[in-house]
Interface confidence: low
């Protein structure tokens, strides 16, 4: 299938559906959006790479999201701009299919990454004592890989091989669209899988997160708390260290485990705590018990000299629990926005009903270490967490809904939607990739500072920026 055109029909003036000034405007706007998307997502990726304080599990999810969004900024946005401005697809069917496959796979991977982040937050808030243990780098890597593989399986084979499945390519030269979209059932199916289902899941998760946060805030207000020496407003963390050989105390009675050396806490075998970096905002609000554990890792925190390392005695019985409790006040560096927090670490081994026992122990210690109610500022940090997630969810819905609504309308009435409206709807999906770095990264003080250092070329000590 070759192009057959009248004399000079290949010239932009003849083929473009837009006037010259419109073409200039479209190129400027689209080019700027592409540039902002590229810069924003490169900044996120480089920040995570160069700053060791940003190398946390939740930021690995952000890194994956930034990869997807960067590809959209580099390829998808610019090729779609070219297609829109010229008025036809000039690069042939092979490049067309490759572009479509890349576009849809990566856009869907971006959505899947948003889903992972939502699930991660949901489990952090609803299972603060058990989930952080499972939340390892390996598990994060598996979840990220699953997001990409699932997106690839959902879109790439159908886009690339549909013409061979049905035995004919119905996409004309000079055009570039997904051939199987002429099938209404497939259109509905993919729209549900790629947008409607993720939106429903993310909305349900957000509802649970906000409900958990609200109920915790209420509990915090009601619950009477025991007095404690005035250290500072404290955020209590409960972390259960699941059995693995590294977690077992080296000495027989386990009393020496997790002692403080030179005022510093030794690194745990546990991955960093379960809060998204972007919640570490520029304020010193305290939060309620195990609302969301601090995002700071042990190597980011200076331990107070007076930190106590205690242990619960344990029997030598094979089925019994071996449990060490460490209570310590973690004092963040002055430029950190995370409230000072008390750590309660429950280091366990094997045995039945282990989690329940450990949770009870942790809860008792939590009550012991809580501040008097009158000294505690209102727990607004949880509201910030919820607000961040709401912003992310709304950004996703606002940018993706128009296109996906049009897709469904189009199934019944193809000419109903003007081409300009269609193009804007398609572009809005891309704009989600521009917004994502702002939504996530800019809510995090460490990210902000690292961005600033990178943009101002201040590379000295950038790896330790907090």
């Amino acid at each position: 299938m070759n192009n057959s055109t009248n004399s000079s029909n290949n010239s932009l003036a003849l083929t473009s559906p837009y006037k010259t000034f419109e073409v200039v405007f479209i190129v400027l706007v689209a080019g700027s959006l592409s540039l902002v998307t590229i810069i924003g997502n490169i900044l996120v990726m480089v920040s995570i790479k160069v700053n060791r304080h940003l190398q946390t599990v939740n930021n690995y999810f952000l890194f994956s999201l930034a990869c997807a969004d960067l590809i959209i900024g580099v390829f998808s946005m610019n090729l779609y701009t070219l297609y829109t401005v010229i008025g036809y697809w000039p690069l042939g069917p092979v490049v067309c299919d490759l572009w479509l496959a890349l576009d849809y796979v990566v856009s869907n991977a971006s959505v899947m990454n948003l889903l992972i982040i939502s699930f991660d937050r949901y489990f952090c808030v609803t299972k603060p004592l058990t989930y952080p243990v499972k939340r390892t780098t390996k598990m994060a890597g598996m979840m990220i890989a699953a997001a990409w593989v699932l997106s690839f399986i959902l879109w790439a084979p159908a886009i690339l091989f549909w013409q061979f499945i049905v035995g004919v390519r119905t996409v004309e030269d000079g055009e570039c669209y997904i051939q199987f979209f002429s099938n209404a059932a497939v259109t509905f199916g993919t729209a549900i899988a790629a947008f409607y289902l993720p939106v429903i899941i993310m909305t349900v998760l957000y509802w649970h997160i906000s409900r958990a946060s609200k109920s915790r805030i209420k509990k915090d207000k009601k619950e009477p708390v025991a007095n404690q020496d005035p250290v500072s407003p404290s955020l209590v963390q409960g972390r259960i260290v699941k059995p693995n050989n590294n977690n077992m105390p080296s000495s027989d009675d386990g009393l020496e485990h997790n002692k403080i050396q030179n005022g510093k806490a030794p690194r745990d075998p546990v991955t960093e705590n379960c809060v998204q970096g972007e919640e570490k905002e520029s304020s010193n609000d305290s939060t309620s018990v195990s609302a969301v554990a601090s995002n700071m890792r042990d190597d980011e925190i200076t331990q107070d000299e007076n930190t106590v390392s205690t242990s619960l005695g344990h029997s030598k019985d094979e089925n019994s629990k071996q449990t060490c409790i460490r209570i310590g006040t973690k004092t963040p560096k002055s430029d950190s926005c995370t409230p000072t927090n008390t750590t309660v670490e429950v280091v366990g081994s094997s045995g039945q009903n282990g989690d329940e026992k450990q949770n009870i122990v942790a809860r008792k210690i939590v009550k012991m270490t809580k501040q008097p109610a009158k000294k505690k500022p209102p727990p607004s940090r949880e509201k910030k967490v919820t607000r961040t997630i709401l912003a992310i969810l709304l950004a996703f819905i606002i940018t993706w809904a128009p296109y996906n609504v049009m897709v469904l309308i189009n199934t019944f009435c193809a000419p109903c939607i003007p081409n300009t409206v269609w193009t804007i709807g398609y572009w809005l999906c891309y704009i989600n990739s521009t917004i994502n770095p702002a939504c996530y990264a800019l809510c995090n003080a460490t990210f902000k500072k690292t961005f600033k250092h990178l943009l101002m070329c201040h590379y000295k000590n950038i790896g330790a920026t907090r």
């Epitope: 055109t5 003849l14 036809y88 004309e172 000079g174 979209f181």
Partner: nanobody
Framework: QVQLQESGGGLVQPGGSLRLSCAAS????????VGWYRQAPGKEREWVAA???????TYADSVKGRFTISRDNAKNTVYLQMNSLKLEDTAVYYC?????????WGQGTQVTVSS
Amino acid sequence: QVQLQESGGGLVQPGGSLRLSCAASGSIANLNSVGWYRQAPGKEREWVAAILAGGFATYADSVKGRFTISRDNAKNTVYLQMNSLKLEDTAVYYCNTPDRPGASWGQGTQVTVSS
């Protein structure tokens, strides 16, 4: 709501000509592309020709040099001029805006080439 309606089909002898029209109930200026498709009995629907907003015309190899597509935005109509018709051109011809997902299909117009 813009609806597309095909017309101009009929019975013609091999080597003969027909002109198909695709009339829109609203403006076609906003449609990036309008294409003609055909479906022969027992076969998959195949693309025949398309014309983009700026007048860029493109054709399937099987009809190149014999068919001509044009659009008249003032009349909101797209035409397919078919010359040197062959027996294998017998099919139901449809017009559509194929650059959108889930394009719905009209009734089409029957073209029969028979000696």
